[in-house]
Each structure stands twice: as structure tokens, then as C-alpha cells.
């Protein structure tokens, strides 16, 4: 049977055993059984599915990753320094400056750390049975219009770590089975929904760490109906309109992180009914509009750390109750009191500023920071019970 | 089968209006802009403007602004284009066409709608 | 606006030979890689129909016959061989710049 402990304090597994808030997840075994210490990680949902992603994305990236096989080559010819195995082709640093010309049946054509630096008309037209491309850490600079005509059976693009100013709209137009299109660390400066015509099964985009200011004040997820995952950490932009994510009803994390916004419109969320992680961390929102996540509801992840908010409302997370993870860290709440998060039923995990904080927050099992720093653990459990 | 279906001809009196429509058939209407093209008798053909028909966005050639609207009917995936202030220079064969664009063209075009202003 | 100047007005060409129609534009068309102007074919009573897009790419269902080319300001429009059913007025159309423009069209004749 369940254990009931006190507020603030949290059972030891299925021991007869409570401790307090500040000795769970401090990485210490204070119970005994390390209960105290298990499910203390603090990925929900989607952050699984990302490491998973990451270490696919990795594995495909690594330049020994078709040595281990030893089937033979379908492709017919392939170019000096490309390896070959049954439909998939690997070209990573092979010192190509333009696309090869292999057999029409590849599956998977690796051209990763090469020199090429344009995507000209019609390049892959005759690939239709391409699924996985891989064009990161070239020099591209300028993508043709044409450039992906053809390509019906891709379903991975990716485009990151190279010089892209800008996509034509249309220029996705045929790839109706693309479900990852990652266009990381490009100079892109501008986009528009047209810019991802075409791609009504994507369902990740990453657009970290390009050079955008604003987003359309139009319905971006407009030709991207199925889109499940949209990242744009590191960019400029600097503020969220309430026309942008109207039409990502699909939406399940926004990844805003790392950007310039300083104003948030209040309806900017209103269509994310389906957002489960939200991050709005290291910006420069000073105000929260009162209903800013009054549409929220299956949110379990939000972020909002390292903002200068100057006051976070009373009844601002009302309407999260399947909050699991709230991040405010490096922000100085002068307001800060247990109303706040008492609507928070099933937040397991919180971030604050200062470790005093925690004691606003005692229902929360999770806290950090879970020291000040300079106080003993003795003195924190005395101040504790103190208070 | 993709298919833009034009209104019948029409004969108007100088100084009136009309409104010329184009039903589309055979794909997502709102997935793709209207665009509306003008053809004088024995001429060329001149760009009016389009319309997105997902937002109702509508882009003009400064030419036909103040003479032309763009509107659509999404429940019946059909657009319009109303002409006001009709002169004898408004007598043309008016087309609709879909725009592709991925393509940068018009690939498909209704049969064209006649207006003739004459008293 | 960008003026698209079509010659020559009319040409009257042999059954199985080359037509070759030119088009050329006030301003250059191109936006990076690519040459945002298009060919159409039209006929008496009929609607234009799309040829040739973004200067070379060849519109599915038309025949191999038809070939654009050029870039820039000068764009060309081939047809080879002729044959009877091409007796049409060919237009050209940029689309890199708003307002559209169309060029005033190139009349086939089959000799």
C-alpha cells in the first residue's frame, strides 16, 4: 500500500520510511533502498524520443558506420573514397564538389563533410527511391528552386551546419513523405508557411541556430499538418505573434530557447492543445500574459528560466494539471508563495533560482538547487523543520 | 481530374459590375493560389492578381487595383473576381488558373469567362 | 514592371523542322540558380497551357519536342521537329517579380 507522508516530505519506496523534499534526488542514498534516489530524471515524454532520435542521428553521422557490414554494393559504381553497402551509399568526406551519379535505386546517400556548394536544378530527380539524405557540413550556399524535384520517397533531409540564406517556397514541394527535415546551424534569415510547402507528412523541423529575427504573422504549420516537433533554439527572434502556431494543432514541443523574445502575444499558444513540452528559456521576456498557458492542458514540460520576469501572476500555472517539470531558474520571484504551484498535482520535478524556494513548492518531490551552497545539510533540515 | 470551371459569358452596360466565377475540382483548393488573367481580344494576356484561398490573402498588380476583388467560397472550392466600373476597355476573355508553386507557373487554367461592355 | 519582348511576331516554319522563339526581358528573371520564366501554347478558343517552367523544366504530358533554355534576360523557346498540331500563339511569362508579366506572343504557322 501507498505510504502517506507529511507535506514536504516523500516516501523511501515502499518503506514505512518519509524524508524530506531536500533528500530526494541529491544524489545520496539517505533511505537506505535508493528510492530516494530513483526516478529522479526529469525526461517526460518527448525527451525520450529525442535521445533516441540524437543517437540514430549520430550513429548515421559517424564515417565508420558502413565498414561493419560487408554486403555487397547495389548501386553499381560509386565514386573513389565512397563506401558502398547493399542500397546505401556513404560519401563522407570523399572531397566531392558536386552530387554523384549512382545507380536510381540508392536508398540512403551519405554526403556529409564534402565542398559542395550549390543544390542546382533537378540534382536528385532521378533518386525516387531515396529515402535518407544526408548534405551536412558542406559549403551550400544556394538551393535551386528544383533542387529536391523528384524525390517522392525521402524521408530524412538533412541540411545542417552549412551556409543557406534562404529556401525558395516551393522548394519542398515534392517531398510528401519527408518526416525530418533538419536544417541546424544555417544562416537562414527568413521564413514563410510556403517556405515548407509540400511536406504534409514532416513531422520534426529543427531550425536551431540560424539567424531569424521574426516568424511569419501567418499561419507557419499551414503545409506541415502532421508537424509534431518544431525547434528553433538559437535564433533571433524576438517576439511570438498570435497568428504563427495557429494552424499546429499537432503540435507537441516548441522549442524556443535561446532566442530574442521579449513579447509574447496572449493568444501566441492558444491552438497548442496538444503541446506537451514548452521552452521559453534564456530570452528576454520581462511580462506573462496573465492566460499566456490558459490552453495548455496536456503541458507536462514547461521552461521558462533565465528570462528578467519581473512577476509571475499568483494563478499564472492554474490551468497546468498535467504540469511534470517546471523550470524557473534565474528568476528572482519577489511574489513567490505556495498558491502558485499548489494547483501543480503532478509536477514531480522544479527548478528555482535559490534553494529557499523549494519551501514554496513542498509537494513537489524534485526541487534544485537542493542546497544553498554554503549551509550544511544539517542546517537546511533545521531550517526546514523550523519553518 | 483537375478542372476549373468557368461562369457562362456575360453582357453588361457600361458603368455596371460582374462577377466572374471559377469552380475548382480534383485537388485541395486551398492548397494552391488563384491567379486571374486578363486577354483583350487578338492581345496578350495580363496578370490581374491571385488569392490564397487557406487565409484570403489577396496580392493585385497595381494595374486592376480598385477595379478588381478576389474572393473565394471555401465550402464550395470556388473563387471569384468582381469587376466594378465597367468601360468598353473591361470587354476581355478573363481566366483563372491555378498556380504551382513549386513550379513558379500557372499549370492549369479555366476555359475563360467573356465579358462584353456595350450599351 | 519587367517588359518581355517575344520575336519575331509570326514565324511560318515546315512540317519537321526547328521553330526557334525568343524572349527577352527588360530585367534579369534569374533569383540565384534558377530563371523564373515559363513558355505557353495557346490555341483559338482555348486556354493558355503550360510548356516549360522555370526556363527548361519540361510540363509532364508535353512531348519531348519542346525545349526552353537561356537565363538572365534572353530565354529561347525550341520546338523540334514540328509538327501540324503545334500551329498555336506561343506566349512567354516571368514569375520572378510581381506583377507577373507575359511577352506579347509568337504566332506558328505550319508551312
Known amino acids: 500500500q501507498d505510504v502517506s507522508c507529511p507535506l514536504g516530505s516523500f516516501p523511501c519506496g515502499n518503506m514505512s520510511r518519509c524524508l524530506p523534499q531536500l533528500l530526494h534526488c541529491n544524489g545520496v542514498d539517505d533511505c537506505g533502498n535508493r528510492a530516494d534516489e530513483d526516478h529522479c530524471g526529469d525526461n517526460n515524454g518527448w525527451s525520450l524520443q529525442l535521445d533516441k532520435y540524437f543517437a540514430n542521428y549520430y550513429k548515421l553521422a559517424s564515417t565508420n558506420s558502413f565498414e561493419a557490414e560487408t554486403s555487397e554494393c547495389l548501386v553499381g559504381s560509386v565514386p573513389m573514397h565512397c563506401l558502398c553497402r547493399d542500397l546505401e551509399l556513404d560519401c563522407d568526406e570523399a572531397n566531392l564538389r558536386a552530387v554523384p551519379s549512382v545507380s536510381s535505386n540508392v536508398t540512403v546517400m551519405s554526403l556529409q563533410r564534402n565542398f559542395i556548394r550549390t543544390l542546382p536544378p533537378n540534382g536528385f530527380r532521378k533518386y525516387h527511391e531515396l529515402q535518407k539524405l544526408c548534405l551536412q557540413n558542406n559549403r551550400i550556399h544556394s538551393v535551386s528552386v528544383s533542387a529536391f524535384r523528384g524525390l517522392r520517397s525521402l524521408t530524412k533531409l538533412y541540411l545542417s551546419h552549412n551556409r543557406i540564406t534562404f529556401l525558395k517556397p516551393g522548394v519542398f514541394e515534392d517531398l510528401h513523405r519527408l518526416e525530418w527535415l533538419i536544417i541546424e546551424d544555417n544562416h537562414l534569415s527568413r521564413i514563410s508557411p510556403l517556405t515548407f510547402y509540400g511536406l504534409n507528412s514532416l513531422i520534426l523541423l529543427v531550425l536551431m541556430n540560424n539567424a531569424l529575427t521574426r516568424l511569419p504573422d501567418k499561419p507557419l504549420c499551414q503545409h506541415m499538418p502532421r508537424l509534431h516537433w518544431l525547434d528553433f533554439e538559437g535564433n533571433r527572434i524576438h517576439n511570438l505573434r498570435n497568428l504563427t502556431f495557429i494552424s499546429c494543432n499537432n503540435l507537441t514541443v516548441l522549442v524556443m530557447r535561446k532566442n530574442k523574445i521579449n513579447y509574447l502575444n496572449e493568444h501566441a499558444f492558444t491552438h497548442l492543445q496538444k503541446l506537451d513540452e514548452l521552452d521559453l528559456g534564456s530570452n528576454k521576456i520581462e511580462n506573462l500574459p496573465p492566460n499566456i498557458f490558459k490552453d495548455l492542458k496536456e503541458l507536462s514540460q514547461l521552461n521558462i528560466s533565465y528570462n528578467p520576469i519581473q512577476k509571475i501572476e499568483v494563478n499564472q500555472f492554474d490551468c497546468l494539471a498535467k504540469l511534470k517539470s517546471l523550470s524557473l531558474e534565474g528568476i528572482e520571484i519577489s511574489n513567490i508563495q505556495q498558491r502558485m504551484f499548489r494547483p501543480l498535482i503532478n509536477l514531480s520535478h522544479i527548478y528555482f533560482k535559490k534553494f529557499q524556494y523549494c519551501g514554496y513548492a513542498p509537494h513537489v518531490r524534485s526541487c534544485k538547487p537542493n542546497t544553498d551552497g554554503i549551509s550544511s545539510l544539517e542546517n537546511l533540515l533545521a531550517s526546514i523543520i523550523q519553518r | 481530374e483537375i478542372q476549373l470551371q468557368q461562369s457562362r459569358p456575360e453582357l453588361v452596360r457600361p458603368g455596371a459590375s460582374v462577377k466572374v466565377s471559377c469552380q475548382a475540382s480534383g485537388y485541395a483548393f486551398t492548397n494552391y493560389n488563384m491567379y486571374w488573367v486578363k486577354q483583350s481580344h487578338g492581345k496578350s494576356l495580363e496578370w490581374i492578381g491571385y488569392i490564397d484561398p487557406y487565409n484570403d490573402d489577396t496580392t493585385y498588380n497595381q494595374k486592376f487595383k480598385g477595379k478588381a476583388t478576389l474572393t473565394v467560397d471555401k465550402s464550395s472550392s470556388t473563387a471569384y473576381m468582381h469587376l466594378n466600373s465597367l468601360t468598353s476597355e473591361d470587354s476581355a476573355v478573363f481566366y483563372c488558373?491555378?498556380?504551382?508553386?513549386?513550379?513558379?507557373?500557372?499549370?492549369?487554367w479555366g476555359q475563360g469567362a467573356s465579358v462584353t461592355v456595350s450599351s | 514592371d519587367i517588359v518581355l519582348t517575344q520575336s519575331p511576331a509570326s514565324l511560318a516554319v515546315s512540317l519537321g523542322q526547328r521553330a526557334t522563339i525568343s524572349c527577352k526581358a527588360s530585367?534579369?528573371?534569374?533569383?540565384?540558380?534558377?530563371?523564373?520564366m515559363n513558355w505557353y501554347q495557346q490555341k483559338p478558343g482555348q486556354p493558355p497551357k503550360l510548356l516549360i517552367y522555370?526556363?527548361?523544366n519540361l510540363e509532364s504530358g508535353i512531348p519531348a519536342r519542346f525545349s526552353g533554355s537561356g537565363s538572365g534576360t534572353d530565354f529561347t523557346l525550341n520546338i523540334h521537329p514540328v509538327e501540324e498540331e503545334d500551329a498555336a500563339t506561343y506566349y512567354c511569362q516571368q514569375s520572378n517579380e510581381d506583377p507577373f508579366t507575359f511577352g506579347s506572343g509568337t504566332k506558328l504557322e505550319i508551312k
Open positions: 488558373a491555378r498556380f504551382r508553386l513549386g513550379y513558379y507557373a500557372m499549370d492549369y
Open positions: 522555370v526556363a527548361s
Open positions: 530585367q534579369s528573371v534569374d533569383y540565384d540558380l534558377d530563371s523564373y
